[in-house]
Interface confidence: low
């Protein structure tokens, strides 16, 4: 007998608003395989079961996060495969302040990523870059996390803000700094970048 899950990964990241189908199938040497998904929250996707296969459709809602397990059995023999589903939101919505930097004076720069999920410091990281390198001498302050005001009800999205206390930019001043925000997900790394021009 054969037991297959497609996609075969044990962890899957799904962008909010996009759909994903996970197909679990099994064939038996004799008789028809019984295949079903278990460990599903009532709101986690919809399941279409066919002889020998079961299709879990995830709609890319934040409530779809979970770890369903596909179970296939031939008679008394059974096999299982769990899939950790993480729904994420990481739009390109970075806001920096101030809009530009002034050389020759100390200043504080903030960078805010809006409408994100998960709002987890372990999965989201900020960097202040000069070219492709982190800006030396920039002092990272305590990050802040706030719930976004939602137009419609649902699982809340968050905004995360990182501030840095900058040293005086030397002369000649660089043309710009960049705030870079990286979201690290299972087998997926996403990055957004926003320029902060320097007045010349």
């Amino acid at each position: 007998q054969s037991f297959q899950v497609n996609p075969p990964e044990s962890e899957v990241a799904v962008a909010m608003g996009t759909s994903l189908q996970i197909t679990c199938s099994m064939s038996c040497d004799e008789g028809v395989a019984r295949v079903h998904w278990r460990g599903l929250d009532t709101s986690l996707g919809s399941v279409q079961t066919l002889p020998g296969s079961s299709i879990l459709s995830v709609r890319g809602m934040l409530s779809d996060t979970g770890t369903p397990v596909c179970v296939g059995s031939c008679g008394s023999r059974s096999f299982q495969h769990s899939v950790k589903i993480l729904v994420y939101a990481f739009p390109d919505q970075l806001v920096v302040s101030p809009e530009f930097l002034v050389p020759g004076q100390d200043q504080v720069v903030s960078c805010t990523a809006h409408n994100i999920w998960p709002a987890d410091p372990n999965s989201l990281s900020f960097a202040l870059l000069l070219g492709e390198q982190r800006l030396e001498g920039a002092q990272a302050l305590e990050p802040e996390q706030e719930e976004e005001i939602q137009e419609a009800e649902g699982t809340p999205l968050f905004r995360m803000t990182q501030r840095w206390r900058l040293p005086s930019l030397g002369t000649p001043a660089p043309p710009a700094l960049h705030c870079q925000v990286t979201m690290q997900l299972p087998k997926l790394v996403l990055t957004h970048r926003k320029e902060i021009p320097v007045l010349q």
């Epitope: 460990g39 929250d41 059974s78 299982q80 950790k84």
Partner: antibody, heavy 121, light 107 residues
């Protein structure tokens, strides 16, 4: 009746690795998944992960990710659990347990006798 | 992770007593709930699976009930061999988690 027989007690130094074996007999090895559960002295039960004897698929608890490796040898119906970078808090009895499909629930029906791993300098 | 909270953590009872142990899950786990008995120096032994199904060979004085988040293990008439530690376990989602245990002692 499935029987799970584990390897003997081990004493290890901090930073070392330990590999515990669990040999299955009396059942269809390839249809089972083997869980590993540990119990520190005087403490409760802690699930570490499982391995499918059928296809070698593993699923580890986040806490042990990167330190634990579960493997199987179908020719000898044996599964192995290797834990690396040992520290004193890894001192525990380590159990293997066979997970058997039963009416939509997956209870650990059969357990090994346990292997005491002591981590001490 | 799903947290499993057992109560009480210990209890004293006499032979013949009716004993009830509760287990609460931090999330809805349907009936993916098992109960184990463990005696000192021994491996756990499965008593109840799927919240209320009695495992083969387990005396009928043991029973389980509940679904969703609240579950109960009942020993209708405590016997001398029942003095042990009892654990609930959820298998609804990975990682599988156990309650902290309930120790049943002789009064």
């Amino acid at each position: 009746q499935v029987q799970l027989v584990q390897s003997g007690a081990e004493v290890k130094k901090p930073g070392a690795s330990v590999k515990v074996s669990c040999k299955a007999s009396g059942g269809t090895f390839s249809s089972s998944a083997i869980s590993w559960v540990r119990q520190a002295p005087g403490q409760g039960l802690e699930w570490m992960g499982w391995i499918s004897a059928y296809n070698g698929y593993t699923n580890y608890a986040q806490k042990f990710q990167g330190r634990v490796t579960m493997t199987r040898d179908t020719s000898t119906s044996t599964v192995y659990m290797e834990l690396s970078s040992l520290r004193s808090e890894d001192t525990a009895v380590y159990y293997c347990a066979s997970r058997v499909h039963s009416g939509g629930s997956y209870p650990d029906d059969y357990w090994g006798q346990g292997t005491l791993v002591t981590v001490s300098s | 992770d799903i947290q499993m909270t057992q109560s009480p953590s210990s209890l004293s009872a006499s032979v013949g007593d009716r004993v009830t142990i509760t287990c609460q899950a931090s999330e809805h786990i349907y009936n993916y709930l098992n109960w184990y008995q463990q005696k000192p120096g021994k491996a756990p032994k499965l008593l109840i699976y799927a919240a209320s199904s009695l495992q083969s060979g387990v005396p009928s004085r043991f029973s389980g009930s509940g679904s969703g988040t609240d579950f109960t293990l009942t020993i209708s008439s405590l016997q001398p061999e029942d003095f042990a530690t009892y654990y609930c376990q959820q298998t609804d989602s990975i990682p599988i988690t156990f309650g902290q245990g309930t120790k049943v002692e002789i009064k």
